[in-house]
Each structure stands twice: as structure tokens, then as C-alpha cells.
């Protein structure tokens, strides 16, 4: 991973584009920390394992988060 101690945040760019929950392998929500003062959302896609930084402020991404958490709550007993 191209990472040095001076890199504070993971996302160089962020995407507003809606992501189909079915195409998601994993969704990571990285809370703000001493290293990066903002929330970062990283989607790992099933296709080729591509990772995409998402815009936490985007309406489409907020809807995605809701859909994913709803799906999780359905699965958990």
C-alpha cells in the first residue's frame, strides 16, 4: 500500500455515485481520528476487489448506509 507516516487520510478523491449494495463486498466506515479529522467511507466492490472512497455527505451514500444497516439488522438474530 502506498502509505507513509505523513499520509493523514485515505481518500484522495470521493465519489457521490450510488453503489448497488449487491455489488458490495465490504463497506468500511472509518471514524475521524487524530490522523484524519473526517469520517471516511470505503466500499470494496466484488468486481476485481476495487476499493472506492465514498462521500459521507452525499444523499446517495447516506441511502446506501441505511440500506446496508437494514440488511445487517435483518441478518442478526
Amino acid at each position: 500500500v502506498p502509505l507513509s507516516r505523513t499520509v493523514r487520510c485515505t481518500c484522495i478523491s470521493i465519489s457521490n455515485q450510488p453503489v448497488n449494495p449487491r455489488s458490495l463486498e465490504k463497506l468500511e466506515i472509518i471514524p475521524a481520528s487524530q490522523f484524519c479529522p473526517r469520517v471516511e467511507i470505503i466500499a470494496t466492490m466484488k468486481k476485481k476487489g476495487e476499493k472506492r472512497c465514498l462521500n459521507p455527505e452525499s444523499k446517495a451514500i447516506k441511502n446506501l448506509l441505511k440500506a446496508v444497516s437494514k440488511e445487517r439488522s435483518k441478518r442478526s438474530p
Epitope: 500500500v1 502506498p2 502509505l3 507513509s4 505523513t6 499520509v7 493523514r8 487520510c9 485515505t10 481518500c11 484522495i12 478523491s13 470521493i14 465519489s15 457521490n16 455515485q17 484524519c36 479529522p37 473526517r38 470505503i42 466500499a43 476485481k48 476495487e50 476499493k51 472506492r52 472512497c53 465514498l54 462521500n55
Partner: antibody, heavy 124, light 109 residues
Framework: QMQLVESGGGVVQPGRSLRLSCTAS????????MHWVRQAPGKGLEWVAV????????FYVDSVKGRFTISRDNSKNTLYLEMNSLRAEDTAIYYC?????????????????WGQGTTVTVSL | EIVLTQSPGTLSLSPGERATLSCRAS???????LAWYQQKPGQAPRLLIY???SRATGIPDRFSGSGSGTDFTLTISRLEPEDFAVYYC??????????FGPGTKVDIK
């Protein structure tokens, strides 16, 4: 359509300064990392600097560290390159380029939109 | 620092022929960090391939990328007149820095 337009190039004497600008349109500028890439006459491409979408990180090629500063004003959709202590070897076409949507340190989507470039000539 | 080497320096081919361009890295590069660009005289570069093998938006399917580790390839299956240009590979490496190869010129035989 997505567009980047550079300005600010010109002829300058060694040791002097110059500020390049790059104005973006057709996309949400504040969402994308931005780069400066240069090309000396008859030579290949050389990456110069990058700035994260929110300005949180900035990185430079070794040859310009301490002399060049990349910055951005998201309210004006504009990217800047402040160039100090210019040298003859800085003579080049300077392009600004957009980092692809969603790029991060774990996956790189390439520089997907480029300006037409502005020419900087450092000469006595 | 990773150094990229491209070969051949110049490739002389005719329209309709297949072009195979090589990009070799001095150390292993994750395919997630490898891109290819095309540049025509007097024009800005254009992104062709990212992630070693994914075509950028609007790029015709005659362009394909492959490879892993230290060896990567850009293939143009059937050269069209507009494909004669210089091609650069590029990697995103630690620090982080974004290094370009020296380029391969594809010209008309």
C-alpha cells in the same frame, strides 16, 4: 462536459517566481484530488505534485520540494501551483489533471481529466 | 523508489496490426496502482487503463491491459489511424509519488 483550463505560464528569469492556476468546470471540484504534471520540450511526462480533495495531504516530486507549493480554493473551483526559485530545468508545459472519482491509497483510478497545459519558460 | 522501463522505445506498425507495449517495474507493483495513458502530438495525455486492466470511460475495447508484479502490458488489438501516439505507463507508489515510464512511441510503418 468536464474541463480544466490552466493559466499563468510565461517567460521568467531563473530565481524568479510564477503562480499557475487551473480552473475546473463540469464536475464537483471539491470531491477530487488534483495533480500538476509537467512535460519538458521533447521529453516525457513528469508528475510534480498532488493535493487531496480537501487539501488534507500534499505531496511533491523531490526535485521541486521546498520550491513549489500546491494549493486549492474549492469555493473558486481553482487549483494553484506557486513556483519559487525557478530553474532552467523547470521549463515545461504544465498540465493540471483530476484524480479519478473514489481514488484512495488502496486503489488508484488514474488521472482521468486533463487540461491543455500552460507553458513555463525559465530563461535569461 | 520504483523505476518504470518501457519497451520498445518505438514501435513501427501498420494500421490493422496488433501492438504490444511493455512496462517493467524495478520492484513489484500492485496491479491496483498501474495506469496507462495515450498522448498525441500537441495534445494533453488521455487515461486509457487503470488498475492494470480496467478501461477508462469511453475507451474502445481494442485497448486492453494485463500483467502483475513487475511486468505489465498494453495491447491494441487492431491499430486504427488515430492510435498512432506515445503511450505512457504510470504507477502510484509509496510516499506517495506518481511515476511515469519514459513512453513508447507507436508510429506508422
Amino acid at each position: 462536459q468536464m474541463q480544466l483550463v490552466e493559466s499563468g505560464g510565461g517567460v521568467v528569469q531563473p530565481g524568479r517566481s510564477l503562480r499557475l492556476s487551473c480552473t475546473a468546470s463540469g464536475f464537483t471540484f471539491s470531491n477530487n484530488g488534483m495533480h500538476w504534471v509537467r512535460q519538458a520540450p521533447g521529453k516525457g511526462l513528469e508528475w510534480v505534485a498532488v493535493i487531496w480533495f480537501d487539501g488534507m495531504n500534499k505531496f511533491y516530486v523531490d526535485s521541486v520540494k521546498g520550491r513549489f507549493t500546491i494549493s486549492r480554493d474549492n469555493s473558486k473551483n481553482t487549483l494553484y501551483l506557486e513556483m519559487n526559485s525557478l530553474r532552467a530545468e523547470d521549463t515545461a508545459i504544465y498540465y493540471c489533471a483530476r484524480e479519478g472519482d473514489g481514488s484512495g491509497i488502496y486503489y488508484y483510478y488514474g488521472m482521468d481529466v486533463w487540461g491543455q497545459g500552460t507553458t513555463v519558460t525559465v530563461s535569461l | 523508489e520504483i523505476v518504470l522501463t518501457q519497451s520498445p522505445g518505438t514501435l513501427s506498425l501498420s494500421p490493422g496490426e496488433r501492438a504490444t507495449l511493455s512496462c517493467r517495474a524495478s520492484q513489484s507493483v500492485s496491479s491496483s496502482y498501474l495506469a496507462w495513458y495515450q498522448q498525441k502530438p500537441g495534445q494533453a495525455p488521455r487515461l486509457l487503463i487503470y488498475g492494470a486492466s480496467s478501461r477508462a470511460t469511453g475507451i474502445p475495447d481494442r485497448f486492453s491491459g494485463s500483467g502483475s508484479g513487475t511486468d505489465f502490458t498494453l495491447t491494441i488489438s487492431r491499430l486504427e489511424p488515430e492510435d498512432f501516439a506515445v503511450y505512457y505507463c504510470q504507477q502510484y507508489g509509496s510516499s506517495p509519488i506518481f511515476t511515469f515510464g519514459p513512453g513508447t512511441k507507436v508510429d506508422i510503418k
